[in-house]
């Protein structure tokens, strides 16, 4: 019946409605059905929310920052039904609500809780800074605070630095990782603990390839089973890291199952793609080839980031021409 | 059951100011809209006042409206009319009356009344 | 704000007869109409609410009716406890105007 919103039931007549920032939500409220309904729902037993009595809407007296943003289930209030639906919720709207609602055989008032949460999609980033290599977890707008929880190899790390900024509305928090000189496999959890909702980035890096000038080298690139679920939505993103910034080579998406090639001599396999295998063919290698190749898998649950080092060297005859 | 006790009645000098109070027992008093009504003894009935179940809207009649203040205070079960500048026609009885719900519907119940008489 | 007027002001009728009064509003109300009665030094009991629905335990021979503008409360056949003065009241929005009252009694 309530699709927008989850409810976590506690007593005293008390429910917990929990919405996500900007999105509709509803909150519930039910009576004994009787003739002439009155329903008053308010803000902090102070805020007036939505007013309707006599058949009708009265809302001359809704705070300002309700309008434009309530409505009753107006066909279903004959069957008890005098629950709120409320559009784009924002932080500002968290707290009590009361819903009384009277008719000519009884008065009864209900409590709803709103707690509103934020989780934009977190992302994993590598990058270089002069001659050190970071990861980053960052989330742009989160609320409440999350957890972030970093391991190397599967082992919790403790060092867990968080840059936050907080604004009106959420924090943004970045947290960054050194792992210069680094082979290990990186992860790095962030949990929304009112959402119930965690994302998690995934780090490895493959050992080094030697190729020579004009061969082709393979680059593996497959979902840890794990977090990956193929019903999901994902992008997959090959690119090559060239004096400190990646150029996309090409990039695959799972919703229209489109790949998008930007450079020639990539290619992909159509059939591992269908067996989720993103590996990739790079044709005809030349000396400036040489680099880093990030594989980035990424969904709304997840990032996971597959790094390869590519060094091509002079072939024979290129050598014995200089 | 509902029971509604008004007092705070009596004679007063034009000009001057009384406050009635009405005692709520028998039901949810916080729930429910209060009006205060009253009648000329002999004549009819005349709306005075009403005010909702938490207070937050308050309607008068234009007879009385700025001289006259309805209020409640939930945590007492207590109804007031605080009647300023009186005049010889607010000689009245002064019913407190219950609401059907929060205070814009009809009346469901009457106290007995109390007589507020003004005279020089 | 809307005017109550209310036809007879009095009446006197005999045990049995059927009773007519009438209650009119300057402006259209819907069914928000409540009429009271009032007994001899006694205070006003709600007798019909939404302009037709009876408040529970009033005898069955009042009855009520109308919409809009016009409405009428009926005692269908007069007993000598229905002496009294009978209200309309109007409760679509403030202030809830009573009409003047229609006084009853016993030939």
């Known amino acids: 019946i309530f699709p927008l919103a989850f409810f976590i039931y506690v007593p005293m007549n008390e429910q917990i409605v929990i919405g996500r920032l900007d999105e509709d939500i509803i909150l519930p409220s039910s009576f004994e059905r009787g003739s002439e309904v009155v329903i008053h729902w308010k803000y902090q037993d102070s805020y007036k929310v939505h007013s309707y009595y006599k058949g009708s809407d009265h809302l001359e007296s809704q705070d300002p920052r309700y309008a434009n943003r309530t409505s009753l289930f107006y066909n279903e209030i004959q069957n008890g039904n005098a629950s709120l639906f409320f559009r784009r919720v924002s932080l500002l709207d968290e707290g009590i609500y009361t819903c009384y609602v009277g008719t000519a055989i009884q008065v009864i008032t209900n409590k709803v809780v709103l707690k509103v949460g934020v989780f934009l999609t977190p992302v994993m980033k590598y990058e270089k800074r002069n001659t050190n290599s970071f990861l980053i977890c960052s989330v742009l707008s989160v609320y409440p605070r999350p957890i972030i929880t970093w391991k190397m190899d599967n082992t919790p790390i403790s060092e867990n630095n968080m840059e936050e900024t907080g604004s009106l509305d959420s924090f943004s928090i970045n947290s960054p990782l050194n792992i210069t000189g680094s082979n290990s496999s990186y992860e790095c959890t962030i949990e929304n603990s009112l959402l119930k909702q965690t994302w998690t980035g995934r780090w490895t890096m493959k050992d080094g390839l030697h190729k020579m000038q004009s061969e082709h080298v393979s680059l593996s690139c497959q979902p840890v089973n794990d977090y990956f679920s193929p019903n999901q939505d994902f992008k997959v993103t090959w690119s090559r890291m060239k004096s400190g910034t990646f150029s996309v080579l090409a990039y695959y998406l799972s919703s229209s199952q489109n790949t998008i090639i930007n450079e020639s001599r990539f290619s992909w396999n159509k059939e591992l793609i269908n067996q989720s295998d993103f590996s990739m063919n790079l044709m005809d290698l030349n000396l400036s080839d040489s680099g880093e190749y990030l594989c980035n898998i990424s969904s709304d649950e997840y990032t996971l980031l597959t790094i390869h080092t590519v060094h091509v060297e002079p072939s024979q005859e290129t050598a014995s021409h200089n | 059951q509902v029971q509604l006790v008004e007092s705070g009645g009596g004679v007063v000098q034009p000009g001057r100011s009384l406050r009635l109070s009405c005692a709520a027992s028998?039901?949810?008093?916080?729930?429910?809209?209060m009006h205060w009504v009253r009648q000329v003894p002999g004549k009819g009935l005349e709306w005075v006042a009403v005010?909702?179940?938490?207070?937050?809207?308050?309607d008068y009649a234009d007879s009385v409206k700025g001289r006259f203040t309805i209020s409640r205070d939930n945590s007492k079960n207590t109804l007031y009319l605080q009647m300023n500048s009186l005049r010889v026609e607010d000689t009245a009885v002064y019913y407190c009356?219950?609401?059907?719900?929060?205070?814009?519907?009809?009346?469901?119940?009457w106290g007995q009344g109390t007589l507020v008489t003004v005279s020089s | 704000d809307i005017q109550m007027t209310q036809s007879p002001s009095s009446l006197s009728a005999s045990v049995g007869d059927r009773v007519t009064i009438t209650c009119r509003a300057s402006?259209?109300?819907?069914?928000?109409l409540a009429w009271y009665q009032q007994k001899p030094g006694k205070v006003p009991k709600l007798l019909i609410y939404?302009?037709?629905t009876l408040q529970s335990g009033v005898p069955s021979r009042f009855s009520g009716s109308g919409s809009g503008t016009d409405f009428t409360l009926t005692i269908s056949s007069l007993q000598p406890e229905d002496v009294a003065t009978y209200y309309c009241?109007?409760?679509?929005?403030?202030?809830?105007?009573f009409g003047p009252g229609t006084k009853v009694d016993i030939k």
């Open positions: 009356a219950k609401d059907l719900i929060s205070g814009i519907y009809y009346v469901d119940h």
């Open positions: 028998g039901f949810t008093f916080s729930n429910y809209g």
């Open positions: 005010i909702w179940y938490d207070a937050s809207e308050k």
């Open positions: 402006q259209g109300i819907s069914n928000y």
């Open positions: 939404a302009a037709s």
């Open positions: 009241q109007k409760y679509q929005s403030a202030p809830f105007t």
